[in-house]
């Protein structure tokens, strides 16, 4: 029999690597059987996940699994960071892993570099 | 039933590039992660780099990061490496493994391995 | 990069024997989700490896149980309880926490 559990399916150790003055959609795949939980996303700030308020959310539906988005319209430079949603269930709170997004600000960069380029600059997370 | 499978020129040319795909059936690229290995004769195994077909985005072995490029292509559900200027010291067998997801994150299935030979 | 150190590199036991391998990491092994990302696989010759265990002491379907694993932080063993002939292999653990990816340089299981 299957867990109805809620899941969140953020992949542990992910990577986005977006350009400022882009939009970009962060999604936090969540699987739930009856009711669809509560989510909320925070960002790192060192061991501490402050939560977002007031940001632009959405939740969009597939098949097998739901889908609670949170929108940068557009990305800033300050967006740069590691991300975890978060769910409300039974009260409990259930945690994703987290997932990093590497921000360019494409004003200081002459041209958009590789994502192979990005991975190799994690220290853009600490500027 | 999951399953992947190397393919690739099996004698390269020292100072060329190695080209290898990795096929992937029985499951969505884009729901895992996609590794190479290689083990070189008789020795062990050296992990090289891995994929986020999802979004491309990659992380390398250091040793292998100016030469290797993993990418992937979600429509065909398959993975590929370049691995240039190779050289005798290139010679080896080499994986793809799919890393299976929530909550486990490990190699949970490997390829057959391709063998590859560096020789003029 | 993480060094992972086994010993012995090969063994030579009698069936029925148990079976010892240990993996030492060069730093902790358990990532800040509270879970430690060292997985032990089997290869025996001509095939690619096989996954026994994984988080440490998780075994894989299939997998018999006379293997187990056990340990935490930076030391590590699996344990072969009674060997059996099909278990003649080389046996890696390998780290999945931090970057790069890194095995152990193998150890080497045979029947005297």
């Known amino acids: 029999k299957e867990s109805c559990d809620v899941q969140l399916y953020i992949k542990r150790q992910s990577y986005h690597s977006i350009f400022a003055g882009d939009p970009f959609k962060l999604e936090c795949p969540v699987k739930y059987c009856a009711h669809r939980p509560q989510v909320t996303w925070c960002k790192l700030n060192g061991t501490t996940c402050v939560k977002l308020e007031g940001r632009h959310t959405s939740w969009k539906q597939e098949k097998n699994l739901s889908f609670f988005i949170l929108h940068f319209e557009p990305v800033l430079p300050s967006d740069n960071g590691s991300y975890r949603c978060s769910a409300n269930f039974l009260s409990a709170i259930i945690e994703s892993h987290s997932t990093t997004l590497y921000v360019t600000d494409v004003k200081s960069a002459s041209e958009r570099p590789s994502k192979d380029e990005m991975a190799s600059r994690p220290w853009l997370l600490y500027s | 039933q999951v399953q992947l499978q190397e393919s690739g020129p099996g004698l390269v040319k020292p100072s060329g590039t190695l080209s290898l795909t990795c096929a992937d059936s029985?499951?969505?690229?884009?729901?895992?992660?996609i590794h190479w290995v290689r083990q070189p004769p008789g020795k062990g195994l050296e992990w090289i780099g891995r994929i986020d077909p999802a979004n491309g985005f990659t992380r390398y072995n250091p040793s292998f990061k100016s030469r290797a490029t993993i990418s992937s292509d979600k429509s065909k559900n398959q993975a590929s490496l370049k691995l240039s200027s190779v050289t005798a010291a290139d010679t080896a067998v080499y994986y793809c493994?799919?890393?299976?997801?929530?909550?486990?994150?490990?190699?949970?299935?490997w390829g057959q391995g391709t063998t590859v030979t560096v020789s003029s | 990069d993480i060094v992972m150190t086994q010993s012995p590199d090969s063994l030579a036991l009698s069936l029925g024997e148990r079976a010892t391998i240990n993996c030492k990491s060069s730093q902790s092994l358990l990532d800040v989700d509270g879970k430690t990302y060292l997985n032990w696989f089997q290869q025996k010759p001509g095939q690619p490896p096989k996954r026994l265990i994984y988080?440490?002491?998780k075994l894989d379907s299939g997998v018999p149980d006379r293997f187990s694993g056990s340990g935490s932080g930076t030391d590590f063993t699996l344990t072969i309880s009674s060997v059996q002939a099909e278990d003649v292999a080389v046996y890696y653990c390998w780290q999945g926490t931090h970057f790069p990816r890194t095995f152990g340089q193998g150890t080497k299981l045979e029947i005297k």
């Open positions: 029985g499951f969505n690229i884009k729901d895992t992660y």
């Open positions: 988080l440490v002491s």
């Open positions: 493994a799919r890393e299976d997801g929530y909550p486990y994150y490990t190699l949970d299935c």
